[in-house]
């Protein structure tokens, strides 16, 4: 059936807590206010309607709920907590809706959400627990299978005084909830680094996007644990090099595709173990495509054409005869 | 100016009903969040009931929950509380509110109440 | 539900003189990108009026001897110099959660 629009909502309380008793029983699949339902697709959409808050009288039946486009600011704990539960809610988009505040248990109490979507919302203050809804050192599995979280990063002056990358980290590793994680993206978000323990405790990872950050090195970060690891994306960096180690472990990975475009490759003697690896590898996608930024009489030559007398360092000059 | 106007107060039973109004001029009412907050004689302010901007979301004080029915008529810039199994204790001046938002929000504007009295 | 504890219960204040009300929240009411905490001013015989915002924020039209501060669970307003218009009941309020709930109120007199 065609989307329908709901022209005066009249429903439940439905407070941020799972023991909320409605106020009055909501009509079974009635459509929110400024939302649009079809309950044949089982999806809700109340977008680009400027809410401040999530609906409170969201049919039963939804599977697929977009909430793009809104002002919601902050997610309390239990904001998708109903009675009865929101038990078939699997899909949620949340993205470009001025969220600036996740708070611990904010996806609480939706027992089927296996895809989140909190792209585009500037998380200044994204809880440790707010996917595992608890702060125990070991919280129930969630359900999540994808997470994508593309541009959260807020604008420099919003940003607390931590860590952003470790922020977000805390949020993924917390309880372990997310250890049914096969998809999550992190592109565009001035990551500077990756902390190194992220991946190992991410183990079901098929696909991770970390592309258009600032990522500089891999030295520390290990893929040795994502083995149904398929596809990393890691265009749009700041990479100068790929060391042995790292081109090892990505060589091992039985089914991964590699996306490098994009870095700012330094084609100097650092450069000839990786020049060598792309030479024999099919794991990097586009290979041919990958060109040297620096040093500046290398600039556009393309990776796969260089051999090991192109790759040379300056001597270093000692110290007696350095200029300041 | 901003104006915020209840009406509908009196003297009724227990069990009984009353349907109170809130006439909102002065601002674009359909983007304003709404409250009721009462006051019981020589008492502290108590908050009843939230409804967002567009009818979207309803929020109520677990002391009034299953009874009051919170509501709003953007066309005519009104708000509403069906008031059903009144009880002695929702004895009170009622205030109608203006917010923002529900947590990122206050009570920016009240309008100057409407008693509400609760007695056999 | 969120307690709101405010001291003192009542205060007379010479005019001219500071006045300072505290209100102290059960449970942190502060995120690292807003605190929900509010202050209103209810003067006899009318209904309450905004002071200050998210703890600190002087509402349009308040007069700037009016300060607040404070962050987690305690927080404060100030009056630099009490006015005789300044009597009434003051309640701090918070909104992080449902319910909303106020502190019990503080009466302001003056000597």
């Known amino acids: 059936s065609s989307p329908t629009s709901s022209a005066s909502s009249f429903s439940s309380s439905a407070p941020f807590l799972a023991s909320a008793v409605s106020a009055q029983p909501p009509l079974p699949d009635q459509c929110p206010a400024l939302c649009e339902c079809s309950e044949a697709a089982r999806t809700v959409k109340c977008v680009n309607r400027n809410l401040t808050e999530v609906p409170t009288d969201l049919p039963a039946y939804v599977r697929n709920l977009f909430l793009t486009g809104n002002q919601l600011a902050v997610l309390p704990a239990g904001a998708f907590a109903r009675r009865p539960p929101l038990a078939e809610l699997a899909a949620l988009n949340l993205s470009g809706s001025r969220l600036d505040e996740v708070r611990a248990g904010a996806f609480e109490h939706l027992p089927s959400l296996r895809q989140l979507d909190l792209s585009h919302n500037p998380l200044a203050d994204l809880s440790p627990f707010a996917f595992s809804g608890s702060n125990a050192s070991v919280s129930a599995p969630s359900p999540l299978v994808e997470l994508i979280l593309n541009h959260i990063v807020p604008p420099e002056d919003e940003r607390q005084n931590r860590s952003f990358e470790g922020m977000v980290v805390a949020a993924l590793l917390a309880g372990r909830a997310l250890q049914g994680l096969r998809r999550l993206e992190l592109a565009s978000n001035h990551f500077l680094y990756l902390p190194r323990d992220v991946l190992a405790q991410l183990p079901s990872l098929r696909h991770l996007d970390l592309s258009n950050n600032s990522l500089v090195s891999l030295t520390y970060v290990s893929f040795r644990n994502l083995t149904h690891l398929e596809s990393l994306h890691l265009e749009d960096n700041a990479l100068k090099v790929l060391h042995n180690g790292t081109l090892a472990e990505l060589q091992g990975l039985p089914h991964i595709r590699v996306f490098l475009d994009n870095n700012p490759w330094v084609c100097d003697c650092h450069m000839a173990d990786m020049v060598t690896w792309l030479k024999e590898t099919e794991v990097v996608q586009g290979k041919d495509r990958l060109t040297c930024a620096y040093p500046e009489k290398m600039r556009n030559r393309v990776l796969l054409e260089l051999n090991s007398a192109d790759l040379d360092c300056d001597p270093i000059l000692p110290p007696s005869l350095q200029t300041s | 100016e901003v104006q915020l106007v209840e009406s509908g107060g009196g003297l009724v039973q227990p069990g009984g009903s009353l349907r109170l109004s809130c006439a909102a001029s002065?601002?674009?009412?359909?983007?304003?969040?709404m409250h009721w907050v009462r006051q019981a004689p020589g008492k502290g302010l108590e908050w009843v009931s939230y409804?967002?901007?567009?009818?979207?979301?309803?929020y109520y004080a677990d002391t009034v929950k299953g009874r009051f029915t919170i509501s709003r008529d953007n066309a005519k810039n009104s708000l509403y509380l069906q008031m059903n199994s009144l009880r002695d204790e929702d004895t009170a001046v009622y205030y109608c509110?203006?917010?923002?938002?529900?947590?990122?929000?206050?009570?920016?504007?009240w309008g100057q109440g409407t008693t509400v009295t609760v007695s056999s | 539900d969120i307690v709101l504890t405010q001291t003192p219960l009542s205060l007379s204040v010479t005019p001219g003189q500071p006045a300072s009300i505290s209100c102290r929240a059960s449970?942190?009411?502060?995120?690292?990108?807003?605190?929900?905490l509010h202050w209103y001013l209810q003067k006899p015989g009318q209904p309450p009026q905004l002071l200050i915002k998210?703890?600190?924020n002087l509402e349009s039209g308040v007069p700037d001897r009016f300060s607040g501060s404070g962050s987690g669970t305690d927080f404060t307003l100030k009056i630099s110099r009490v006015e005789a218009e300044d009597v009434g009941v003051y309640y701090c309020?918070?909104?992080?959660?449902?319910?909303?709930?106020f502190g019990q109120g503080t009466k302001l007199e003056i000597k």
């Open positions: 998210s703890a600190s």
């Open positions: 409804i967002s901007s567009g009818s979207t979301s309803f």
């Open positions: 509110a203006r917010t923002n938002s529900l947590l990122r929000g206050f009570f920016d504007a």
């Open positions: 309020q918070h909104s992080w959660e449902i319910p909303l709930t």
């Open positions: 449970q942190s009411v502060s995120s690292s990108s807003y605190t929900y």
């Open positions: 002065g601002f674009t009412f359909s983007n304003f969040g």
